[in-house]
Amino acid sequence: DNPERYSTNLSNHVDDFTTFRGTELSFLVTTHQPTNLVLPSNGSMHNYCPQQTKITSAFKYINTVISCTIFIVGMVGNATLLRIIYQNKCMRNGPNALIASLALGDLIYVVIDLPINVFKLLAGRWPFDHNDFGVFLCKLFPFLQKSSVGITVLNLCALSVDRYRAVASWSRVQGIGIPLVTAIEIVSIWILSFILAIPEAIGFVMVPFEYRGEQHKTCMLNATSKFMEFYQDVKDWWLFGFYFCMPLVCTAIFYTLMTCEMLNRRNGSLRIALSEHLKQRREVAKTVFCLVVIFALCWFPLHLSRILKKTVYNEMDKNRCELLSFLLLMDYIGINLATMNSCINPIALYFVSKKFKNCFQSCLCCCCYQSKSLMTSVPMNGTSIQWKNHDQNNHNTDRSSHKDSMN
């Protein structure tokens, strides 16, 4: 898949035979299938589309600049976000724990996968391609790509469910700490994301290829079993269905249920009693919805280009070059937008949430201070897990914090 978070080829791409199992489309990464000399069944080479090289050359540098920017912004933003949630007891709660999980997934991708991708873009080859560390990176790279996207997707689903649960049980006002159910959710999300990424680690190998007599090696998805052949065939649809449609459908369902719940209880006396609290819950729900919308906008172009490639593009068509140029351009734009999603959440939270904005400002200037003006007095109850500092005395000082410390 491409070297960019959702794919190899890559990117990566010997002559014009690249990423998509013997087609010309250089989709990254180096490397759906990265750069390999994949040939038609008769073993002969065909002519290429001239625009491909021009687009690839132009985007090589554009992608590098964007990747470096995403690396810096993503590392600073996600690390700061994690620091804010970890250091501030008032910020340690269910939805924020899920946001921290989201940030950690993005941070892992940004720190490990992006540098590999930039190397691949600039050097035109897989790092350490002639030793065992290169083989390890070849398996790690797509594994972390898929894990990171999986973590994002499942956390967004969990946040949507969490918002519905928060509204459905008005009286359940949580104190400081992470609810046990949220902790279990997070652990499950990470385990499931890693499990779903295992086929990538199995399927991606360093494949040797020859070009003009010279021996090269590239990292690509190479099906060697019936299951991996099946996975390779359905991969684009699986990615589109599970890693794109599922979180949107999940959000749509639970936000519809949440809206119905709010409308049904609109005139309840409990609602009046907790009007301030509900207002804040609505704000958190808006923030979560904003994260889902950003996810959809970032990932839609890439998924669309992949699906169009799968359904519309015919490599044997003599007039394929115009469509190829469009798909290639769309794919590169999609790759950059999708990669951008791994650094955009902290930025989105900065603009959407007043509390996060203040914490970001103070944390980036010095260290995030706990300002009492940011807290709203709400009673606490419910079982919770403290990340840090279990001293009961501290609970009194932090009584003002509540489950939805996000607005």
Epitope: T35, P50, K54, T56, A123, E210, G213
Partner: antibody, heavy 116, light 112 residues
Framework: EVHLVESGGGLVQPGGSLKLSCAAS????????MSWVRQTPDKRLELVAT????????YYRDSVKGRFTISRDNAKNTLYLQMSSLKSDDTAMYYC?????????WGQGTSVTVSS | DVLMTQTPLSLPVSLGDHASISCRSS???????????LEWYLQKPGQSPQLLIY???NRFSGVPDRFTGSGSGTDFTLRISRVEAEDLGVYFC?????????FGSGTKLEIK
């Protein structure tokens, strides 16, 4: 020392066939790509066909596709070009060249004339 | 096809002079492995072509350091710092990055 020696050229009528050979010595033949390049009477160079180390991958220029076949025998250290349905446009000096990221060694060439 | 345009077609020089031959490709010739397979060949009168420069700027073994290759993307140049009698002949540029591989039309280096 690397040596490439072409043979099999000659005068042939349009529609006829010829098989060119290129005997290689002085290097490990099976580890190099090989190509046939021709030089037309107006001195232009054209890549005719190329083959990878094990013979599994071949390339032909459009004008010879379906008429020419490039092959190799690694046991005999020999490269071949089977030419059929020859046209007057195929008249040229045919060179075989070793390819390893560049065509670093060339043979002296064999002349092919297609004329009635 | 990638069209390789060489200029000039003929280059009259005096021995000891500097010479420069330009080659322009109609498209980018960077291969997907990151390598630009741009070569320069010299064909001396009555001989087969011989490799001078490969991958834009690398001199082939035995080629004097008078020969320098440079360029990127679509524009490439071969420079000969001090022309000697043995340098006379036809110079061809060649791209081996994209099928079909193509040669330039040639530049004849001759004595003024």
């Amino acid at each position: 020392e690397v040596h490439l020696v072409e043979s099999g050229g000659g005068l042939v009528q349009p529609g006829g066939s010829l098989k060119l050979s290129c005997a290689a010595s002085g290097f490990t033949f099976s580890t190099y790509g090989m190509s046939w390049v021709r030089q037309t009477p107006d001195k232009r160079l054209e890549l005719v066909a190329t083959i990878n180390t094990n013979g599994g991958t071949t390339y032909y220029r459009d004008s010879v596709k379906g008429r020419f076949t490039i092959s190799r025998d690694n046991a005999k250290n020999t490269l071949y070009l089977q030419m059929s349905s020859l046209k007057s446009d195929d008249t040229a000096m045919y060179y075989c060249a070793r390819d390893y990221g560049a065509m670093d060694y060339w043979g002296q060439g064999t002349s092919v004339t297609v004329s009635s | 096809d990638v069209l390789m345009t060489q200029t000039p077609l003929s280059l009259p020089v005096s021995l000891g002079d500097h010479a420069s031959i330009s080659c322009r490709s109609s498209q980018y010739i960077v291969h997907s492995t990151g390598t630009t397979y741009l070569e320069w060949y010299l064909q001396k009168p009555g001989q087969s072509p011989q490799l001078l420069i490969y991958k834009v700027s690398n001199r082939f073994s035995g080629v004097p350091d008078r020969f320098t290759g440079s360029g990127s993307g679509t524009d490439f140049t071969l420079r000969i710092s001090r022309v000697e009698a043995e340098d006379l002949g036809v110079y061809f540029c060649f791209q081996g990055s994209h099928f079909p591989f193509t040669f330039g039309s040639g530049t004849k280096l001759e004595i003024k």
